[in-house]
Structures are given as C-alpha cells and as structure tokens.
C-alpha cells in the first residue's frame, strides 16, 4: 500500500472556488504546485496558502497545508509547491521517535554528568559522564538528581502536523 498522506491534521476544510489556472499534463503527470483533474486532461493549480504538491504527480487533489501549533514557530509559509515548515519554540525540541509533539528541554544534567550540547529545536541538551565521556541515555533524571545549569523556557506540548 502506498503511503500518500503525511500530514496529521486531517479535518475536512472548506474548499475555495475552483481555480481557473489550468494546463495539460505531461506524460500523464502534473508539475509541482498542481493536481490532475477528475478526467485526467488538465492540471489544476493548488491554492496558495491552502494546499500544495511537491512533485510531478497524478494526484486528484493537492495536499493540505500544515498549520503550526501553539508552541511552534513558522519558519517558512506554505506555498503551492512546499508545505509549511514549523519548528519548536525556544526551550523545546522534537525527537525523531516522538515527532508528534514538542517536548520541554531538560534544564540541567544529572549529578556526575556535564553538559556538552545545548537545547535546540531538534534535540534536548546533551550530557556526558564527567569521567568516561559517554553520552547520557536521555531519560529525564529524578528531580533531586538534577543539577540546574540554565533555566529552560516553559512551553506547552505541541503536536506535529507536517
């Protein structure tokens, strides 16, 4: 089965009036920023800021633009050929294994460890053992074990929609 839909935000949206901008498919495909018509004879432009397509395609509709959640900032807006790019707010990050939400960065490393990497929108602070220099597994330590370094920015969890 082909995995087509990558967006998580899947509520039906109100469709604007049909676009008039049309062209003919090339070898059965329409260019980025377009989808194919029901009869396969025309390419119909996606609606700027509403939907998009990134590749040559024979999709019967354009994909819906992601909307950044609260707790995320918009790095670049949705165009007809590119989805919105959202990033976690300062002090939060998104892990590859839990991409649906921004998690708060830890404010410090466990006792016996030293911070070697800062909080970024895509990674928590990085801690290594003082002696061995091996990385910490990433489990959040118990509160009493935490050595505070710099205060983190509180942020509510944010769900990924793109």
């Amino acid at each position: 089965e082909s995995a087509l839909i990558t967006q998580q935000d899947l509520a039906p949206q109100q469709r604007a009036a049909p676009q008039q901008k049309r062209s003919s498919p090339s070898e059965g495909l329409c260019p980025p920023g377009h989808h194919i018509s029901e009869d396969g004879r025309d390419c119909i432009s996606c609606k700027y800021g509403q939907d998009y397509s990134t590749h040559w395609n024979d999709l019967l509709f354009c994909l819906r633009c992601t909307r950044c959640d609260s707790g995320e900032v918009e790095l670049s807006p949705c165009t007809t050929t590119r989805n919105t790019v959202c990033q976690c707010e300062e002090g939060t990050f998104r892990e590859e294994d839990s991409p649906e939400m921004c998690r708060k960065c830890r404010t410090g490393c466990p006792r016996g460890m030293v911070k070697v990497g800062d909080c970024t929108p895509w990674s928590d602070i990085e801690c290594v053992h003082k002696e061995s220099g091996t990385k910490h597994s990433g489990e959040v330590p118990a509160v009493e074990e935490t050595v505070t370094s710099s205060p983190g920015t509180p942020a509510s969890p944010c769900s990924l929609s793109g």
Partner: antibody, heavy 122, light 112 residues
Framework: EVQLQQSGPELVKPGASVKISCKAS????????MNWMKQSHGKSLEWIGR????????FYNQKFKGKATLTVDKSSTTAHMELLSLTSEDSAVYFC???????????????WGQGTTLTVSS | DVVMTQTPLSLPVSLGDQASISCRSS???????????LHWYLQKPGQSPKLLIY???NRFSGVPDRFSGSGSGTDFTLKISRVEAEDLGIYFC?????????FGGGTKLEIK
C-alpha cells in the same frame, strides 16, 4: 487484511430516506477514496460517486446528484451514504469500494463491501 | 455516458475449457495520456464483485494466471484458459477513461 463491512438490509417506505454505512479496517482510512455503487436486481452496476476522507471532498455521478449524499466519520473509519426521497427505482444492492487517490490507478475498486440490500415498498 | 456492451450475455462452458468474453465501448478508451482504463471484475453468486484485471491486462494480486485481458481502443477481451468451478459467476467490464465511470451489463459464466 483490508475489510469493508456494510450495514444490514433495509426496508423503507417510499418518500423516506435511508443511511447505509461501510466500516473500513485493515488500512489507512484517510489514504483512499471511498466509492459507492448501485446494482439493481438482475442489472449491471452503476457508479454513484466517491468521498475523499482526507479533505472531505465529494465527486458524484451527475445522475445521482440530489439522490445520494456521501459522508464519513473518520474517528470510526466509517463511510455513509444517505439516499433521499426514495422510490421503488432505488431498490437495489448498494456496495462501497475503495480506490486510489491517483488518476492512473484510481479508476478501479480493489476492495468491495459485501453489499447492503435496500427495498423500497409501501 | 460511455456505454459498455458485453457479449455473450450467458456463456455455458465445460470445466477445463477456454472461455472468452467480449466487451465493447461506445467511445475509444484510450486516454490522452496514452493509457487505457478498462477493467474486469468477477461477481460470484451472493458475493460482491472482485477485481480481476485492471488497465486492460494487469492481473490484480492473487488472481490466477489463467485469467488474461487484451484489447485496445473500443474492443476488449477477457480469456480464461482452463475454466475451474470457482470461476463461475458474472463477469463485468468497466471503464474509467471517461467520467462518469461505467460498467458493462455482465456475462454469466455457467456450466454447460
């Protein structure tokens, strides 16, 4: 395993409306169109239209506009078809069927429901 | 709408025989993209139709290789090389080149 499970038979009076359902399982519900077909007794099949669970769009065979209304409930991965102002001509077996979102592979139905028999009689 | 005409209406065969079903369309089914969107389904008694062949000659997954499709333009054929008991039922052709999509009237394959 892909399955489309339809609701049971219906006996309805002329002039009334009826809503039949098609529960999808075994695949990503939002990844395919849901189509509806009509098979009148001893006759061939007619394509009624299709619903796009991803964005809520519908596309109807002109013949069935005003007769059929297609909807889905994404939370229960169930497609519905409401048939309005019923007459004896609407008595038939109705099937749901899945098709792809792409033009080149979207014109055939790779999986079908078992059918729902509708009888319109006073 | 494109009218799909199937012949024969009924096809009595003996098990092991070859069967051939014809489907003719009122307009060419060759799309402007060069592809032909003609498909075949089998509906066994008391069941829903099942996809056999898509786009003239492509067997759907799990369909035995005794089924084959051919044709072009407006004339198409479904062949079953050696009919088995499980092949009995009504065969429908359908087209998706032109909107609305339409089906043939069906050919009933039965035991002679």
């Amino acid at each position: 395993e892909v399955q489309l499970q339809q609701s049971g038979p219906e006996l309805v009076k002329p002039g009334a409306s009826v809503k039949i359902s098609c529960k999808a399982s075994g695949y990503s519900f939002i990844g395919y169109f849901m189509n509806w077909m009509k098979q009148s007794h001893g006759k061939s099949l007619e394509w009624i239209g299709r619903f796009n669970p991803y964005n809520g769009d519908t596309f109807y065979n002109q013949k069935f506009k005003g007769k059929a209304t297609l909807t889905v409930d994404k939370s229960s991965t169930t497609a519905h078809m409401e048939l309005l102002s019923l007459t004896s001509e609407d008595s038939a077996v109705y099937f749901c069927g899945r098709s792809a979102y792409y033009f080149d592979s979207g014109g055939y139905f790779d999986y079908w429901g078992q059918g729902t028999t509708l009888t319109v009689s006073s | 709408d494109v009218v799909m005409t199937q012949t024969p209406l009924s096809l009595p065969v003996s098990l092991g025989d070859q069967a051939s079903i014809s489907c003719r369309s009122s307009q060419s089914l060759v799309h402007s993209n060069g592809n032909t969107y003609l498909h075949w389904y089998l509906q066994k008694p008391g069941q829903s139709p099942k996809l056999l062949i898509y786009k003239v000659s492509n067997r759907f997954s799990g369909v035995p290789d005794r089924f084959s499709g051919s044709g072009s333009g407006t004339d198409f054929t479904l062949k079953i090389s050696r009919v088995e008991a499980e092949d009995l039922g009504i065969y429908f052709c359908s087209q998706s080149t032109h909107v609305p999509w339409t089906f043939g009237g069906g050919t009933k394959l039965e035991i002679k």
